[in-house]
Interface confidence: low
């Protein structure tokens, strides 16, 4: 057993039939000696009398608050969450696995910039009875401070007979230096509770290889004179790190059919401009990624030939 | 050619080597980003090859300020990789395939680490540790661990060549 | 913090070999490299061997290079070092350090002052 925060205790159980449980003793938060007595949740059955409970926790039906009382009055709490772990594996019946980038994946990170700036998000189709809270550090050995705000949901969607939630996080290293090659990764822990199950979740990682640009701005294209080509210029996005002589982003630039069948014409190219041809119906998309480290490319930013 | 005492270095032919060297470095190993290797144990592999830390003004003020000290920590890690390329690591078993680009890579790390330091002057080299991996499986693991390591190296180094070459040729 | 006890020491003729040990206690060792430096009489403390975290990755000091093994046990929080075909000069007070950064500093291995945690020392003797 273990404390996860003030009053709130989590009991870790092998679950499997017949687990003989974890012998839990309980202490009441008060100065008196006399005329105790416990209780569980809203029930006024009377568990037991004295300072101490003891209580042998094997399912979720022996989890729960426990109060202590004298005479009617509310001396202290104590919840008791239960943690599962099967065949020596703990549970991940929360969250979903995303399966990307790989099976097993319940946290997914990314970052718009080198500038210690990240946000985590998760998947889940638990409506209710539900919190999250979450630590980051770089490096666990000797810890470097990360600050993250309040888990949030930040989107509904309906996934056939399903809907499925999603939270995020937003996180900033304490000391960032955009500069310098990582050589600790971000470790992000999330600690989930739904009704009185306990689980954790971990993902470990370098801003560098999460890093996703936000799309190229401005994107604006101007017809060469007598010529079917045109020429398609682009901003770096604001959200990048600065100065862009050193923070180099590389494009892709292409060229999109109406029809998904066409062929695509795609060039690669480290200026913010090129020279492509505009077809009739087709659109024009270009898409940015760090010049100089292969991380994910941003999503496309698109504008209509005609 | 970056001499200690200050003048510049060829900024412009170490931009085009060095994004040469980025290139290099993921075509050696381009699966990288699917294969998690910090989960596959002695982690610290990586942290025993050189990295550019926040302290070594390679950030652009820094190298408005002194390049020398980025540059000489950037030619520091270029021979520790060019040796560790050229040792039995990558030359033992498994066998790299013939076009195998950790020739070229190899190769490019010297051009870099050549052109950051004239001859006769001798910046402190590093002693490489005695990485000795008795398994094949176990001199692939290291490779791609090495690989990896030194494509985040690498980017570093040519956002520094990168910014100098814009705004610190003469 | 961590405490730090080499043991193993002792006198020993030329040729010969000891093995000494470092043990720790109050902090685990496995997240740390760890060195072994010496000091003979009216001489500065200098470099042995250096073993990273997870034995890796291992230096050692020309003079001892092919003679002297740096191991670690992380399950026994213990790191040894093997001396073998030993010479008059190898003769000195033999001492275990922590190294507190993870990462790798140039040749700040090679400086006793790059280490946080010290053990008292064990004398390793060896005549000809």
């Known amino acids: 057993i273990w404390e996860l925060k003030k009053d709130v205790y989590v009991v870790e159980l092998d679950w499997y039939p017949d687990a003989p449980g974890e012998m839990v003793v309980l202490t009441c938060d008060t100065p008196e000696e006399d005329g105790i007595t416990w209780t569980l949740d809203q029930s006024s059955e009377v568990l037991g009398s004295g300072k101490t409970l003891t209580i042998q926790v094997k399912e979720f039906g022996d989890a729960g608050q426990y109060t202590c009382h004298k005479g009617g009055e509310v001396l202290s709490h104590s919840l008791l969450l239960l943690h599962k772990k099967e065949d020596g594996i703990w549970s991940t019946d929360i969250l979903k696995d995303q399966k990307e980038p790989k099976n097993k994946t319940f946290l997914r990170c990314e970052a718009k910039n080198y500038s210690g700036r990240f946000t985590c998000w998760w998947l889940t189709t638990i409506s209710t009875d539900l919190t999250f809270s979450v630590k980051s550090s770089r490096g666990s050995s000797d810890p470097q401070g990360v600050t993250c705000g309040a888990a949030t949901l930040s989107a509904e969607r309906v996934r056939g007979d399903n809907k499925e939630y999603e939270y995020s996080v937003e996180c900033q290293e304490d000391s960032a230096c955009p500069a310098a090659e990582e050589s600790l990764p971000i470790e992000v822990m999330v600690d989930a509770v739904h009704k009185l199950k306990y689980e954790n979740y971990t993902s470990s990682f370098f801003i560098r290889d999460i890093i996703k640009p936000d799309p190229p701005k401005n994107l604006q294209l101007k017809p060469l004179k007598n010529s079917r080509q045109v020429e398609v210029s682009w901003e770096y996005p604001d959200t990048w790190s600065t100065p862009h002589s050193y923070f180099s982003l590389t494009f892709c630039v292409q060229v999109q059919g109406k029809s998904k069948r066409e062929k695509k014409d795609r060039v690669f190219t480290d200026k913010t401009s090129a020279t492509v041809i505009c077809r009739k119906n087709a659109s024009i998309s270009v898409r940015a990624q760090d010049r100089y480290y292969s991380s994910s490319w941003s999503e496309w930013a698109s504008v209509p030939c005609s | 050619r970056a001499v200690p005492g200050g003048s510049s270095p060829a900024w412009t032919q170490c931009q085009q080597l060095s994004q040469k060297l980025c290139t290099l470095a993921w075509s050696a190993h381009p699966l990288v980003g699917h294969m998690d290797l910090r989960e596959e144990g002695d982690e610290e592999t990586t942290n025993d090859v050189p990295h550019i830390q926040c302290g070594d003004g390679c950030d652009p003020q820094g190298l408005r300020d002194n390049s020398q000290f980025c540059l000489q920590r950037i030619h520091q890690g270029l021979i520790f990789y060019e040796k560790l390329l050229g040792s039995d690591i990558f030359t033992g078993e498994p066998s790299l395939l013939p076009d195998s680009p950790v020739g070229q890579l190899h190769a490019s790390l010297l051009g870099l680490s050549q052109l950051l330091q004239p001859e006769g002057h001798h910046w402190e080299t590093q002693q490489i540790p005695s990485l000795s991996p008795s398994q094949p499986w176990q001199r692939l693991l290291l490779r791609f661990k090495i690989l990896r390591s030194l494509q985040a190296f690498v980017a570093v180094a040519a956002r520094v060549f990168a910014h100098g070459a814009a705004t610190l040729s003469p | 913090e961590v405490q730090l006890v080499e043991s193993g020491g002792g006198l020993v003729q030329a040729g010969g070999s000891l093995r000494l040990s470092c043990a720790a206690s109050?902090?685990?060792?496995?997240?740390?490299?760890m060195g072994w430096f010496r000091q003979a009489p009216g001489k500065e403390r200098e470099f042995v061997a250096r073993i990273s975290q997870g034995g890796t990755a291992i230096y050692y000091a020309d003079s001892v290079k092919g003679r002297f093994t740096i191991s670690r046990d992380n399950a026994k929080n213990t790191v040894y070092l093997q001396m073998n075909s030993l010479k008059p000069e190898d003769t000195a007070v033999y001492y275990c350090?922590?190294?507190?950064?993870?990462?790798?500093?140039?040749?700040?291995?090679?400086?006793?002052?790059?280490?946080?945690?010290w053990g008292q020392g064990t004398q390793v003797t060896v005549s000809s």
């Open positions: 350090a922590k190294d507190p950064s993870p990462y790798y500093r140039g040749s700040a291995y090679l400086l006793s002052g790059s280490y946080d945690s």
């Open positions: 109050g902090r685990t060792l496995s997240s740390y490299a």
